[in-house]
Amino acid sequence: PHLRTFTDHFQTCKVQGAWPLIDNNYLNVQVTNTPVLPGSAATATSKLTIIFKNFQECVDQKVYQAEMDELPSAFADGSKNGGDKHGANSLKITEKVSGQHVEIQAKYIGTTIVVRQVGRYLTFAVRMPEEVVNAVEDRDSQGLYLCLRGCPLNQQIDFQAFRANAESPRRPAAASPSPVVPETFPYETAVAKCKEKLPVEDLYYQACVFDLLTTGDVNFTLAAYYALEDGKMLHSNKDKLHLFERTRELPGAVA
Amino acid sequence: CKILKCNSEFWSATSSGSHAPASDDVPEFCAALRTYALCTRRTARTCRGDLAYHSAVHGIEDLMSQHNCSKDGPTSQPRVRTLPPAGDSQERSDSPEICHYEKSFHKHSAAPNYTHCGLFGD
């Protein structure tokens, strides 16, 4: 999936299987990613587990679990708030669109989480205070906390290089992260579809094009669109909302 | 102890919140106060040793005398806004200050710096 880190780095990650997205003193978020097509290096999120840890007199430990075709509007125990403590309503789930869009507000840690199902796969977005982001007991053990550190170098897909290949008249399939590139989606069509929803040619737009070329699944247009919309709602600095290509940096060195 | 449920139902029922009601709203406000008093009385067995209960009881007494409400009279059906659905067994409502990040952690400093992380697509 595409990852926008807390430090506004944008990466496309292979990261197959279960990976920690957030892991701090208050919250643990784990995602499970599966290949979008057989044999593909590109993966998308098929499962999401959020654990809100027991916190003072506010909330009991609560677990939220979403999977493909199952986006609950309640925690695993059936409740919609933080339990039985006096501050239980400082953690709340709101169903925005049944089976498609859920918002979780954790006021006790100033955090808002948006989970969506777009097409077959899940998207995740969070707004969190820096103080909470950095609330980790052991800084050294937080190496694979994707939202903070980004993906490891060996787990990244260079989609800018992929795009260069895609723009050339003959697209060598071997250079693609997916050996099964659907010929039904020419580059120009992908560009047109993405431009329709994402008029600014930023990295969300680039991600959209990449996803359409990789999968031929038009739902990924919506995934990029909603990711940007959620960013609009959740990003505190509106000037940093649109990310554009940078000169190549050392990926994985995001801290 | 469900005293906080009583509190939230009362503040939901009196849309003017803690402000004094207009004179023509007083009967309705008194009815809401009586409902609040009944609710707190019902929590006495399980809340009587807790601060929240005593604060509510004293608050009701003060408001009753301020608005010349009689102890007997009609009660109101609260217009509940943000309580969990009936099927949900968790019934606590109002939050202590520590359960509101901006209020508690940043009482004496600037607003927190927020960060954003997102994961989508393939």
């Epitope: 006096h86 | 102890c1 009385r41 040793g49 807790d50 601060l51 005593h54 202590p96 520590i98």
Partner: antibody, heavy 115, light 112 residues
Framework: EVQLVESGGGLVQPGGSLRLSCAAS????????MNWIRQAPGKGLEWIGM????????HYADSVKGRFTISRDNSKNTLYLQMNSLRAEDTAVYYC????????WGQGTMVTVSS | DVVLTQSPLSLPVTLGQPASISCRSS???????????LEWFQQRPGQSPRLLIY???TRFSGVPDRFSGSGSGTDFTLKISRVEAEDVGVYYC?????????FGQGTKLEIK
């Protein structure tokens, strides 16, 4: 996370005294009534008494009335149980528990009254 | 004082099967406002008691939904829909309606 840690238990002779403490954390101690409950070895639970958040009222079971005193120090987040004129039948694990009605309990401290 | 009588005192159950514990009160636990303050606690071997159910039927936070409480007046029941190994222990009913608060004598649940 609500935590209650009892201490002060031990062996005491009949007629002797003992003071148990219960250190509270993870919640606003001064907002809540608190309880003491005991459990004799191999037996059931017995409620001993409770104290209001501000110590304004205390309630006791008949079996300990006049011998046991519950107190609290909100500045130290600590609940106490002063036990005087102890009898063999007071031998038990003593638990403190949060709330007017107990929801969270400590791990208990053992009191043995024996000569 | 209100006496709570539990039955059975010992309850052997097969894993995955339901279990039911009864608690009878010597007087009604319903208040004049219609509320009933009866709770259920679980005490696993070597552990402190843990609140399961309050006000007859409301599950406490984190309690699995296989536990349910019912009843009114003087007769109350705790049901476990499918017993799991971790459910082994002693279960107590507890009344708060009348002073002093009192516990039932306990029901020991064990696996057959």
């Amino acid at each position: 996370e609500v935590q209650l840690v009892e201490s002060g238990g031990g062996l005491v002779q009949p007629g002797g005294s003992l003071r148990l403490s219960c250190a509270a954390s993870g919640f606003t101690f001064s907002n809540y009534g608190m309880n003491w409950i005991r459990q004799a070895p191999g037996k059931g639970l017995e409620w001993i008494g409770m104290i209001y958040y501000d110590s304004s009222e205390k309630h006791y079971a008949d079996s300990v009335k006049g011998r046991f005193t519950i107190s609290r120090d909100n500045s130290k987040n600590t609940l106490y149980l002063q036990m005087n004129s102890l009898r063999a039948e007071d031998t038990a694990v003593y638990y403190c528990a949060k709330g007017t009605t107990p929801d969270y309990w400590g791990q208990g401290t053992m009191v043995t009254v024996s000569s | 004082d209100v006496v709570l009588t539990q039955s059975p005192l010992s309850l052997p159950v097969t894993l995955g099967q339901p279990a039911s514990i009864s608690c009878r009160s010597s007087q009604s636990l319903e208040t004049s406002d219609g509320d009933t303050f009866l709770e259920w606690f679980q005490q696993r071997p070597g552990q402190s008691p843990r609140l399961l159910i309050y006000e007859v039927s409301t599950r406490f936070s984190g309690v699995p939904d296989r536990f349910s409480g019912s009843g009114s007046g003087t007769d109350f029941t705790l049901k476990i829909s499918r017993v799991e190994a971790e459910d082994v222990g002693v279960y107590y009913c507890f009344q708060v309606t009348h002073d002093p608060m009192t516990f039932g004598q306990g029901t020991k649940l064990e696996i057959k």
